[in-house]
Amino acid sequence: TPEVWVQVRMEATELSSFTIRCGFLGSGSISLVTVSWGGPNGAGGTTLAVLHPERGIRQWAPARQARWETQSSISLILEGSGASSPCANTTFCCKFASFPEGSWEACGSLPPSSDPGLSAPPTPAPILRAD
């Protein structure tokens, strides 16, 4: 069964800067990755970035830099100020559309006890939805 993992990290140098890393553990071909915050994409969440394997990357503030790390994992640096700044309990979600498995999404947030610069290991997060 495919799985999606999500890792959220707050940068020690900039407390309003977060790095989100997501990966897809499956054998299929990824056709699109959508990163959102505030909940799952399409269920109250706000899209931060869309990564298409062929067409490129579209990102929305406060996303600063989205990139593919491998063929099945991505990272996104977020930095905000004021109303658009993420906070420690913000939920970030990654949705991977793949063939033939379909869409798989998982969410994560900063571990409750984490210090800036630390993060939980990138273990598979609970799968919220499989379309």
């Epitope: 990824i30 062929e54 490129g56 830099q65 990139r67």
Partner: antibody, heavy 120, light 113 residues
Framework: EVQLQQSGPELVKPGASVKISCKAS????????MNWVRQSHEKSLEWIGE????????NFNQKFKGKATLTVDKSSSTAFMDLRSLTSKDSAVYYC?????????????WGQGTSVTVSS | DIVMTQSPSSLAMSVGQKVTMSCKSS????????????LAWYQQKPGQSPKLLVY???TRESGVPDRFIGSGSGTDFTLTISSVQAEDLADYFC?????????FGGGTKVEIK
């Protein structure tokens, strides 16, 4: 044949607003994002933002957020850009440009440009 | 934002000569997913709009003469005009189409001697 026909030149006073139009023809308007780009002597080409004509979703260069508003009229296949609180620094040629089908932000067709001059 | 730097700012060549211009990006434009470089080149003739010549660093847009050759990877890119013609008098701009916001270089002006 794909064509993007922009409205004519504008001479406006500082503090005023202006609305530029870009009428698309020769393709299905809602199938391609529309980008807006500014060209001035000092700053070469600068991306202002984009709009998805299908649903009106927009995305901006943070530098132009609050300066530009992007809209579309699907019935006439026309994209619009409103520029507000104009200053002399906003004097430039403004282009609409269609995003190509191969990649985000590779712009395969451009309008002829609309010259905006801000002067008292 | 990704910063694009072009050089030289201008050059003057005779018809038939080979022209090369450079474009450098402040971060890699190579996707780790598909190994494509998200770099485009545009030509802007005097009084005209920009015209897409090349995207993905080396893919020529339909209808563009094969004397226009895009190359490079990562952060360093080159546009070559193998045998420059009088009608190639123009400004040439590189642009990253890797991610939002797309950014342009300052341009290279090609003049014909």
């Amino acid at each position: 044949e794909v064509q993007l026909q922009q409205s004519g030149p504008e001479l406006v006073k500082p503090g005023a607003s202006v609305k530029i139009s870009c009428k698309a023809s020769g393709y299905t308007f809602t199938d391609y994002y529309m980008n807006w780009v500014r060209q001035s002597h000092e700053k070469s080409l600068e991306w202002i933002g984009e709009i998805n004509p299908n649903n009106g979703d927009t995305n901006f260069n943070q530098k132009f957020k609050g300066k530009a508003t992007l809209t579309v009229d699907k019935s006439s296949s026309t994209a619009f850009m409103d520029l507000r609180s104009l200053t002399s620094k906003d004097s430039a040629v403004y282009y609409c440009a269609r995003e190509g089908g191969s990649s985000y932000y590779a712009m395969d067709y451009w309008g002829q440009g609309t010259s905006v001059t801000v002067s008292s | 934002d990704i910063v694009m730097t072009q050089s030289p700012s201008s050059l003057a060549m005779s018809v038939g000569q080979k022209v090369t211009m450079s474009c450098k990006s402040s971060q890699s434009l190579l996707s780790n997913n598909n190994q494509k470089n998200f770099l485009a080149w545009y030509q802007q003739k005097p009084g005209q709009s920009p015209k897409l010549l090349v995207y993905f660093a080396s893919t020529r847009e339909s209808g563009v003469p094969d004397r226009f050759i895009g190359s490079g990877s990562g952060t360093d890119f080159t546009l070559t005009i193998s045998s420059v013609q009088a009608e190639d008098l123009a400004d040439y701009f590189c642009q990253q189409h890797y991610s939002t916001p797309p950014t342009f270089g300052g341009g290279t002006k090609v003049e014909i001697k």
